[in-house]
Structures are given as C-alpha cells and as structure tokens.
C-alpha cells in the first residue's frame, strides 16, 4: 500500500508557508501587508490586549467553531466588545432586585457603532465572569422582549468551582434583532432555573459586575471584567467589496 | 488556473462505485455479501419497515450527524427501538398526575437486550409524536434520578402546528447510564417550562400515547406511535472484532 | 457552496459535487440489500489549483483563495464537505437488520 | 484519530497531521502582525492508498478501509479534519484591530 513518490517534506513546508502568506492576506482582503509607518510606539493598548485575550480564550459553554459557510465566513471577522451599562444607571431601577435574577443592559448605540448593519454580524457572545460557586446551579438566560416580558434563550448547569471562570452564551440572533430595531437600551436577565415544584429558586452564582448587598462588594474587580458582548463582524468596507464581487469564480 | 490532466469521468465513476462496494462491506465488517438462502419470502415485516423509516426520517430537534469519531463510528450501527412501557403499568401510579408533566418509563431489560454493553451504544434518541398544538410551548425533559428527584436534561421551544410531528431528544448519556446500573425501570418526565414568576405552567402539548382524560382518548393511534427510544449501537460480535484489531495500521 | 444545488445545475469545471446514483442490483450486482434499492452517493471531482507564488499578480489571486485553496494547503484537493448517513435493511440468516452507515452520501464538496 | 496527540508522537508514514510552526517575522518576513508572534499552523501529509479492486483479497482490504479510504473516494486524499481559528492584532493606520481568522490551525487530518 505504498505510493511511488518520495515526498520532499521541506518543499511541502515551503509551499504551505507561502500558501499561508496568501491565505492571511486573502482572509483580510489585503492586497499587501499594511504599512507600519503610523503605528504608535510602545506596547499594545491594554483594552486591545484584553480583547485579543477574550477572543483567544475558549470559555465554558462556547461551542467549538462550526464548519463555516463557504463565502462570507471565509473572510476575517473584526472583533469588538461592548461592556454592560454600569449598574448605577437608572435603567436598573425599573427592575426590582430579586433573589432569583440579575439584569444586564446594553447601549445599542455602542452596538451599532461596532456593527453598523445586522447582516454584518457573524457571532455575538454574552460573556460573564462567574465567581466561585459552592453548589451546583442551573441558570437560565432571558432576553428583554417587550414592556415587562422576557423571552427564554438558553440554560446552563454550573458546576461548583473554587476559582472564577468565564461563561459564554451565544446571543447572535438576539443582537442581530437589536441592531434591526430602534431601541436605545436592550437587556438580558440571568435567573435561577425554577422547577414547577421547587420553592428554593435563589440565584446562588455570583457574577462579576454586580455590587448589590446580595452579591457582596465586587467593585474592586469590576472594570473591564463586568459582563460584555463579544462581537465578531465583517467590517463594512470588506462587506461592500464582497457584494461587488459576488459572482462565481 | 487549469490542470494538465483531462479527467476520464467514466473511469472515476467506476472507481467510486467499486470503492463503495468495499466501503459498505467494510462498514458492516462482512468479508462478502451475506447469503440470501434463508430469507423468508414476501415483503419486509411492518415493524422492520417502521424502524427503517424512523431511521431515515430527520425529525425536529435531531441535529445533523456530527463529524464521526474515526475508529468505532466508521462502522455500521445496528438500529433498534424500545417502546415506552404502556401507561396502564403500575409504575405510573406512583407519579401523581399533574397538569405540568407527563411521565415515560422504559424497561431496562429490553434496553439491555438491544444493547448488551453501555460502551456499544453510539446514539440514543427519545422520540415523541406531538399532536397538533394551538400555542407555542416551552417544554423541558428530565431524567428520573433517585427516589423522587429528577435531573434536568434539555429543553425545546415548540411552535404551534396543525399537524402531528415527531420530536427527538438526544439521550445517549442517560441510556448509557441506565445500561450500567441495575435498575429495572427507568424514566423521563416531560414538563412545561416553569418560570420563577409565572403561575400558568400547564403542559399544553399532546404527546401520542397518553390516554388520561386530560389528554383526550388517543388510543386509536397509539400502538407503534407511542414514545420510544431509537438506539444505534455496534453489534456485540462486531465490537469484539474491533477490540481484537485495535492496533494502528 | 459547492453543493448539489449549485453543482448539479452548472457546468463547473473546478471542484464540485458530481451526480452518482448507485443502484445496488445494477451497479453492484447485489440483491441482499432490501431497502433502499439504491441511493445518491455522489462524488467530488475537479481541480483545486494551487494559486500562490511570490511573482503572482497578487490582487487577482487573493479573490480566488476562497474557492481554490481556502485551507492554504500545499496541494489542495477536492473532497467531501457535507456528508449524510444511509440506513439499510438486510438479512443475516432469517433475521432482518436495520443498520445505519455513516457518511455515505456526499452533499457538498470543498477544496481542502 | 489522526490528530496531534497521535501523529506528533509517531513515525506514521501514511496520512497524518505534521508539525509546522509559523513565525510571522522569520518565515513570512512580516512585522505587521503584533499578536501573536507566530502560530502552530500544521499541515496534512501522507498517502491514502486507493485500496479496492475486484481482484483484491477482500478480507485483508476491508479492515484497512477505515483508515485509507473511509469515504470511498475514487482518489482519496489526506486533508484537514479538525480546524481552529486564529485571532490576530494588527494596525490599519493608527488604529489597532483584533480580527479572527477562521480555519487556520490544523488539529487533525483524515483520508477523504
């Protein structure tokens, strides 16, 4: 079952390296590497490194990348993040503190700045930093739907843990909806899973970014670690390029 | 960007056909086609055709086949089904009828007959025939865990529908557990999703196979259409063959 | 996508899924598979040109990467992308068996 | 599976994933990608012999199908199976960008 040809491993490696050169430029739709003439001196900004690390880290609940659609998903996706509106914002006053839920609101103008058109969005993840958890907890994620109604999105069974851990929920469809609508502020609710019989429906898990008495004062590690939306989208100029060349080979 | 070789399409087709001959025999671990000498005359039995059709039909909630694991999942899987224990069995008496749940129990001896070893099971699906549904309903599936406790498994949002439709839940892990344990009867519970605030938690969806007054008398279309477990497993003799040849090429 | 919708209705010369129906009796001379009588196996065929070298007109090549060598292989190859299983009914002795064979039907291809 | 665990620790001659680290500066002469400095791209290499003809000794061949031609291709080919994305940081003008490139890292291969 052998083949006749002997393989020149070094030649194959060189061809693969050259192909990668083309692949990266092609995915970024760059005809040549961007000039570095204007790059500010010094290290990368903190916020950029944080965003890079968020993208690089696989987190609990994030599925491995599915087989991408051939055309649009071949190209690189720009990654941005939009932090949750801080909890002292008046929007939170409308939602009574409860033992079974926490609320997370987002400014849609920030979302639109990051992703100007709903069709450009290829993935949106809600990322939450859960602090240590003593008991197993079954939680559910809801989307604010209309006045005071909430639409179920997904659930997660959280195992006990001694260390903080990032959670990720795929909320692509929801964020695409928000980008299509006119609302200014949109939100999620994280609740304990309530069974029809059970009476103990307390949300035990601590999520970083919530400073109510019930949650303990987490202000020290708030900042960039409060809940955020990680967005992956085709940049507008790349999308226009794609549309104009939408012919087969 | 053309290639030098012209392609003989007919030759490629012939090679593909021959390769399929090998592929099918190889997947079934047959050195040659099985003799047809003992095949009973007449059409295939009803039950076999029903099983074949269940396997062929993609149903709501069943994910497209994931990329299979190379070794064991290359080989063909025998398909069997185990029907739910009928609702007049005394096991159902222990669970009070409620407006928010229905119960489905299975005889583990039947499961073991179909799949002698837990490791042989490659997929188990719980299939339910839902009858027409007037309103959207969010349902949850639970596994009977210990005395009277239930473990959450998954959920489904059912859209309104005028016609009956099969639902499928992947319960591979649960059935594997059951095969490992000593219990005689094991079960599932299908419940309305209960939110922490909401008080209306009635299970609106009708599942074929339940003849309580609340469900209406569906006895006429019971039979083979009551809930069942569709099992895909490596036959024992094929598995033994696999273990003995578990060396790398 | 290089799927049956696109490929069966075009005269694509490059990598594409090609139609192939296997009739168990006619093509394989088999009577032992009772259901189905045959199936659309299909297959992948067509070149995936290697389209990168330092002296290429880059801008022209970049747009083609997506189709011809998305994985940046040193020797791209036309292979199945989406596959589907095939259930069959056959007898072993007097006992009918239903078995599912994974990855038997090619729905789409890709250069990889 | 023909993955990094198996292939990097064996001397497999047939289809397998092979180690390849790309250092953007050294291998591509690029300074414009600020993070990461390089990545484990890897690649697939090795024969997938075509192992079926009517005069073959069936029983010997059948056991090899699984490895060499599981998809019953007319010309099986060693291609990536599991792929992972690569995020990068680069500047466009004065503006840093984080972008995710899909399917850049080969984790395992298969004959297809």
């Amino acid at each position: 079952l052998s083949t006749c040809k002997t393989i020149d491993m070094e030649l194959v490696k060189r061809k693969r390296i050259e192909a990668i050169r083309g692949q990266i430029l092609s995915k970024l739709r760059l005809a040549s590497p961007p000039s570095q003439g204007e790059v500010p001196p010094g290290p990368l900004p903190e916020a950029v490194l944080a965003l890079y690390n968020s993208t690089r880290d696989r987190v609990a609940g994030e599925s491995a990348e599915p087989e991408p659609e051939p055309e649009a998903d071949y190209y690189a996706k720009e990654v941005t993040r939009v932090l949750m509106v801080e909890t002292h914002n008046e929007i939170y006053d409308k939602f009574k503190q409860s033992t079974h839920s926490i609320y997370m609101f987002f400014n849609t103008s920030e979302l639109r700045e990051a992703v100007p058109e709903p069709v450009l969005l290829s993935r949106a993840e809600l990322r939450l930093l859960r602090l240590k958890l003593k008991v197993e907890q079954h939680v559910e994620l809801y989307q604010k739907y209309s006045n005071n109604s909430w639409r179920y999105l997904s659930n997660r069974l959280l195992a006990p843990s001694d260390s903080p851990e990032w959670l990720s929920f795929d909320v692509t469809g929801v964020v695409r909806q928000w980008l299509s609508r006119g609302g200014e502020i949109e939100g999620f609710r994280l609740s304990a899973h309530c069974s029809c019989d059970s009476r103990d429906n307390t949300l035990q898990v601590d999520i970083n970014g919530f400073t109510t008495g019930r949650r303990g004062d987490l202000a020290t590690i708030h900042g960039m670690n409060r809940p955020f939306l990680l967005l992956m989208a085709t940049p507008l100029e790349r999308a226009q390029h794609l549309q104009s060349s939408r012919h087969r080979r | 960007l053309s290639t030098c070789k012209t392609i003989d399409m007919e030759l490629v087709k012939r090679k593909r056909i021959e390769a399929i001959r090998g592929q099918i025999l190889s997947k079934l671990r047959l050195a040659s086609p099985p003799s047809q000498g003992e095949v009973p005359p007449g059409p295939l039995p009803e039950a076999v055709l029903a099983l074949y059709n269940s396997t062929r039909d993609r149903v709501a909630g069943e994910s497209a086949e994931p990329e299979p694991e190379p070794e064991a999942d290359y080989y063909a899987k025998e398909v069997t089904r185990v029907l739910m224990v009928e609702t007049h069995n005394e096991i159902y008496d222990k669970f009070k009828q409620s407006t928010h749940s229905i119960y489905m129990f299975f005889n583990t001896s039947e499961l073991r007959e179909a799949v002698p070893e837990p490791v042989l099971l490659s997929r188990a699906e719980l299939r339910l025939l839902r009858l027409k549904l007037k309103v959207e309903q969010h349902v949850e599936l639970y596994q009977k865990y210990s005395n009277n406790s239930w473990r959450y498994l998954s959920n489904r949002l059912l859209a309104p529908s005028d016609s009956p439709e099969w639902l499928s839940f992947d319960v591979t892990g649960v059935v594997r557990q059951w095969l490992s344990r000593g219990g005689e009867i094991e079960g599932f519970r299908l419940s309305a999703h209960c939110s922490c605030d909401s008080r209306d938690n009635t299970l609106q969806v009708d599942i074929n196979g339940f003849t309580t007054g609340r469900r209406g008398d569906l006895a006429t279309i019971h039979g083979m259409n009551r809930p069942f477990l569709l099992l895909m497993a490596t036959p024992l003799e094929r598995a033994q063959h696999l273990q003995s040849s578990r060396h790398r090429r | 996508a290089l799927d049956t919708n696109y490929c069966f209705s075009s005269t694509e010369k490059n990598c594409c899924v090609r139609q192939l129906y296997i009739d168990f009796r006619k093509d394989l001379g088999w009577k032992w598979i009772h259901e189905p009588k045959g199936y659309h196996a299909n297959f992948c065929l067509g070149p995936c040109p290697y389209i990168w070298s330092l002296d290429t007109q880059y801008s022209k090549v970049l747009a083609l990467y997506n189709q011809h060598n998305p994985g940046a292989s040193a020797a791209p190859c036309c292979v199945p992308q989406a596959l589907e299983p095939l259930p069959i009914v056959y007898y072993v002795g007097r006992k009918p068996k239903v078995e599912q064979l994974s990855n038997m039907i090619v729905r789409s291809c890709k250069c990889s | 599976a023909l993955d990094t665990n198996y292939c990097f620790s064996s001397t497999e001659k047939n289809c397998c994933v092979r180690q390849l680290y790309i250092d953007f500066r050294k291998d591509l002469g690029w300074k414009w990608i600020h993070e990461p400095k390089g990545y484990h791209a890897n690649f697939c290499l090795g024969p997938c012999p075509y192992i079926w003809s009517l005069d073959t000794q069936y029983s010997k061949v059948l056991a090899l199908y699984n490895q060499h031609n599981p998809g019953a291709s007319a010309a099986p080919c060693c291609v990536p199976q599991a792929l992972e994305p690569l995020p990068i940081v680069y500047y466009v003008g004065r503006k840093p960008k984080v972008e995710q490139l899909s399917n850049m890292i080969v984790r395992s291969c298969k004959c297809s």
């Epitope: 760059l30 040549s32 570095q36 003439g37 | - | - | -």
Partner: antibody
C-alpha cells in the same frame, strides 16, 4: 472607475495663500486616506501629507517642509479634498497632485495635477 | 527621514532589451517599496507595490524584487511605450519618501 480631479492652481505672490481642491469619484471616499504630493519643475516627487479615513478619525499628518503652513482637510459629503497653503515661498512652485493612499504604504490613483507658481 | 537613492539616474536601451533599475534605502524598509511610472507631461501611475506586486492593468513584462535595503525594477522586454521616468517610494516609515527618479529613453 476611480477619478481624481485637482483644481485651484495659479500664480501667487510670495507670502500669499491659496486653496487647492480635489474632486474624487468612483470609490467610497470615507474609506480612504487622501494625500497631496508635489513635483517641482524637472524634479522628483515630494509627499506633503495626508488626511486619514473615517476609522482613523480623519486626522492629518504632514511632512516637515510644509508643517504649520499647509492644512489638509476634506468634505466627505462632497467627496472633496483640500489643501490650504499659507505663507507661500518661491520653492513651493510645483505641480500639486492629489492621490489616494492605501494602507499598504502606496498611492494607487493620482489626479492629473494642478500647477502652482509662486513668483513676484 | 529615510533616503531613497535610485541608479542609474538615466539610461538608454533598445526595444526588446531587458533592463533593471535599482533603488537603495538608507535603512531596512521591510519590502514596503513601490514603483511609479511617469510618462512625459503625464501624471504618475502605480506600477508595483510591496516590492513585487503588479498593480492591476500593468503589463507582466514589469516585475520587482528585493528585500532589506536593496530593490530592483525589471522590464523583461522594453517596449516603445515604456519611455518614462520611474520613481521608487518607501512606505515603511513616515514621512513617505521618493527616489530622485530614473529617466528611461529608447536608443
């Protein structure tokens, strides 16, 4: 088709001021940096500066020889680029080109140029 | 600023000749080297960018090569319409700077 058309050149006395314009068409103006390059009679090309695109906040960059005297601006609603030149010197006499600049460090399309003569 | 030096400053060649023009940078410019053609009385046109990449519509008889500080523009078979002045330009470090030009004539 990308087109760049300069206008506004002419004769100016030393110390005087002038504004050059460049009308762009055939591409999404806000996506691109726009640049000015000049060429003194019988001499080589000299880059004067550019104005960045929307993602880079439309900020400007100048060469040392014109910094403080020349100002580049743009009117995106009109797809127009401008070069405001003050305190002109005789050595500013040249053909002034507007050029589209790409992130790759090169100018891919140029206008036909407009001649400025600074003379007393 | 990075200085760009072209050589020769002028050259004369026959139709069909292969010829090269050199450009040297005062420091490593990492392949960000571009070539422009300016025909008499006309506007400059981009020929080659990033050392070796042909701009769209440019005939394939033009090619570029080089690395570090030394770069070359090659015309494989000179045509009458190639009479022009050729400029190199670095795009590695601000301010962008051009070579002084090479004037090409036909014998």
């Amino acid at each position: 088709e990308v087109q760049l058309v300069e206008s506004g050149g002419g004769l100016v006395q030393p110390g005087g001021s002038l504004r050059l314009s460049c009308a762009a068409s055939g591409f999404t103006f806000t996506d691109y940096y726009m640049s000015w390059v000049r060429q003194a009679p019988g001499k080589g090309l000299e880059w004067l500066g550019f104005i960045r695109n929307k993602p880079n906040g439309y900020t400007t960059e100048y060469s040392a020889s014109v910094k403080g005297r020349f100002t580049i601006s743009r009117d995106n609603s009109k797809s127009s680029l401008y070069l405001q030149m003050n305190s002109l010197k005789t050595e500013d006499t040249a053909v002034y080109y507007c050029a589209r600049y790409t992130g790759g460090g090169y100018f891919d399309y140029w206008g036909q140029g407009t001649l400025l003569t600074v003379s007393s | 600023d990075i200085q760009m030096t072209q050589s020769p400053s002028s050259l004369s060649a026959s139709v069909g000749d292969r010829l090269t023009i050199s450009c040297r940078a005062s420091q490593d410019i990492s392949n960000y080297l571009n070539w422009y053609q300016q025909k008499p009385g006309k506007t400059p046109k981009l020929l080659i960018y990033y050392t070796s990449r042909l701009h769209s519509g440019v005939p394939s008889r033009f090619s570029g090569s080089g690395s570090g500080t030394d770069y070359t523009l090659t015309i494989s078979s000179l045509q009458p319409e190639d009479v022009a002045t050729y400029f190199c330009q670095q795009g590695d470090t601000l301010p962008w700077t051009f070579g002084q030009g090479t004037k090409l004539e036909i014998k």
